[in-house]
């Protein structure tokens, strides 16, 4: 559990409390809400971040059409149960004993049930489609410049291995970023695409999770890239199990106005 030793802070997660009482007398940073020690050299898992947030005193188209199995997060914020490694537990329940199964990014993938509901395994979200619309600009961005800038962002800011950024599509004013990461591809120490997408989502909303860093200042060849709305679609390795086709299928994951 490394952290900046000089003043004992967590560069990658401001939703922490840090003290010099970790193993070997090192700085140890605990996530708000759960109290779990986090590794400040990489991104904190989305489950721990959500828990901290809930506890805080708060035609030849190049664009991808999400498949019929794509999930969107219509349930909003909740206080999740995380496993000992900080990942989402497969079954989540609220205070009134209503339970549901989630995928690895914490999005509900079954109908809601009672305490008898079984969720045998945590199903991995292996494909994330981040759909952005940017504010009007004088002209369209150069696609290759935009592609390079977004890949750089995920590599440098979120420490996501470049191989997991599958594609960047652009049809003004819509930008789509495809993240792909199968269970077999994810090695120990690799940033999870779900965590990278969540940090990006919070950055886009102007709610950066990084300690002391300025907000996200996205520029393509010096031109500001200002996002006015975001949709995020999640595709799981095993399709979700709902009792009927959900009409909410294409609802927004989040609606941003800047």
């Amino acid at each position: 559990h490394t952290a900046a030793q000089d003043n004992c802070t967590c560069p990658t997660n401001k939703m922490t409390v840090c003290s010099p009482d970790g193993p070997g007398g090192r700085c140890q940073c605990r996530a708000l809400g759960s109290g779990m020690a986090v590794d400040c050299s990489t991104l904190t898992s989305k489950c721990l971040l959500l828990k901290a947030r809930m506890s805080a005193p708060k035609n030849a188209r190049t664009l991808v059409r999400p498949s019929e199995h794509a999930l969107v997060d219509n349930d909003g914020l909740y206080d999740p149960d995380c496993d000992p490694e900080g990942r989402f537990k497969a079954r989540q329940c609220n205070q009134t004993s209503v339970c549901w199964c989630v995928n690895s990014v914490g999005v509900r993938r079954t109908d809601k049930g009672d305490l008898s509901l079984r969720c045998d395994e945590l199903v991995r979200t292996h494909h994330i489609l981040i759909d952005l619309r940017h504010r009007p600009t004088a002209g369209a961005f150069n696609h290759s410049d935009l592609d390079a800038e977004l890949r750089r962002l995920f590599r440098e800011r979120y420490r996501l291995h470049p191989k997991f950024v599958a594609a960047v599509h652009y049809e003004q004013p819509t930008i789509q970023i495809e993240l792909r990461q199968n269970t077999s591809q994810k090695a120990a120490g690799d940033v999870d695409i779900g965590d990278a997408a969540y940090y990006f989502e919070r950055d886009i909303k102007g709610e950066s999770l990084f300690q002391g860093r300025g907000g996200l200042d996205l520029r393509v060849r010096g031109e500001p890239l200002q996002v006015e709305r975001t949709l995020i679609y999640y595709l799981d390795e095993i399709p979700p199990k709902f009792s009927m086709k959900r009409l909410t299928h294409h609802h927004h994951h989040h609606h941003h106005h800047h």
């Epitope: 409390v17 003290s19 010099p20 009482d21 193993p23 070997g24 109290g35 000992p84």
Partner: antibody, heavy 115, light 107 residues
Framework: QVQLVQSGAEVKKPGASVKVSCKAS????????IHWVRQAPGQGLEWIGT????????VYNQKFRDRVTMTADRSISTAYIELSRLRSDDTAVYYC????????WGQGTTVTVSS | EIVLTQSPATLSLSPGERATLSCRAS??????IHWFQQKPGGAPRLLIK???ESISGIPSRFSGSGSGTDFTLTISSLEPEDFAVYYC?????????FGQGTKLEIK
């Protein structure tokens, strides 16, 4: 040397409140968690909660959440625990301890709840 | 919450013998376990932190081992002053909890 010195014994009636203090010295008070633990007569140790004095961020054991308040006064390096609506089964020795591994403990404060 | 189960509840040994105390966690807690000794009328005293890290001023006969869910406190050769109650405690996540204790008594 590091020391945690607690306030004296208290006798209270059921329904009353009690406030125990823990004065720290010999280290930087703001950079270490202060935990509160209690031990009923002849029983084991029970974690009540913790406070980080630097920003007063407090975490409570669910069992006590609606009755306990932890505070810290950085100017005098003192942490406090207040337990309200006392019951007879709150009779115990209350300890403060430092850091996640409780390396230094106060001497304990006996709280007796009796009508 | 994480439940810590200590065994045995009581251990009867003679001075000079080796004592092995066990603490089992209900889920994986890495090495976030700490061991304490408590004598009648006194506050607990930290013996071992993070499963195996020694503490300044604690005799070298006290050692700890384990990770994940199973942890052990070993006293290599018992001294008369070692007969007391021993507790394990975890700091993996909130709420922190203690084991129920092992009473080490003279045989």
């Amino acid at each position: 040397q590091v020391q945690l010195v607690q306030s004296g014994a208290e006798v209270k009636k059921p329904g009353a409140s009690v406030k125990v203090s823990c004065k720290a010295s010999g280290y930087s008070f703001t950079t270490h968690w202060i935990h509160w633990v209690r031990q009923a007569p002849g029983q084991g140790l029970e974690w009540i909660g913790t406070i980080f004095p630097s920003n007063a961020y407090a975490v409570y054991n669910q069992k006590f959440r609606d009755r306990v308040t932890m505070t810290a006064d950085r100017s005098i390096s003192t942490a406090y625990i207040e337990l309200s609506r006392l019951r007879s089964d709150d009779t115990a020795v209350y300890y403060c301890a430092r850091a996640s591994y409780f390396d230094y403990w106060g001497q304990g404060t006996t709280v007796t709840v009796s009508s | 919450e994480i439940v810590l189960t200590q065994s045995p509840a009581t251990l009867s040994l003679s001075p000079g013998e080796r004592a092995t105390l066990s603490c089992r966690a209900s889920q994986n807690i890495g090495t976030s376990i700490h061991w304490f000794q408590q004598k009648p009328g006194g506050a607990p005293r930290l013996l071992i932190k993070y499963a195996s890290e020694s503490i300044s001023g604690i005799p070298s006969r006290f050692s700890g081992s384990g990770s994940g869910t199973d942890f052990t406190l070993t006293i290599s050769s018992l001294e008369p002053e070692d007969f007391a109650v021993y507790y394990c405690q975890h700091s993996h996540s909130w709420p922190f909890t203690f084991g129920q204790g092992t009473k080490l008594e003279i045989k």
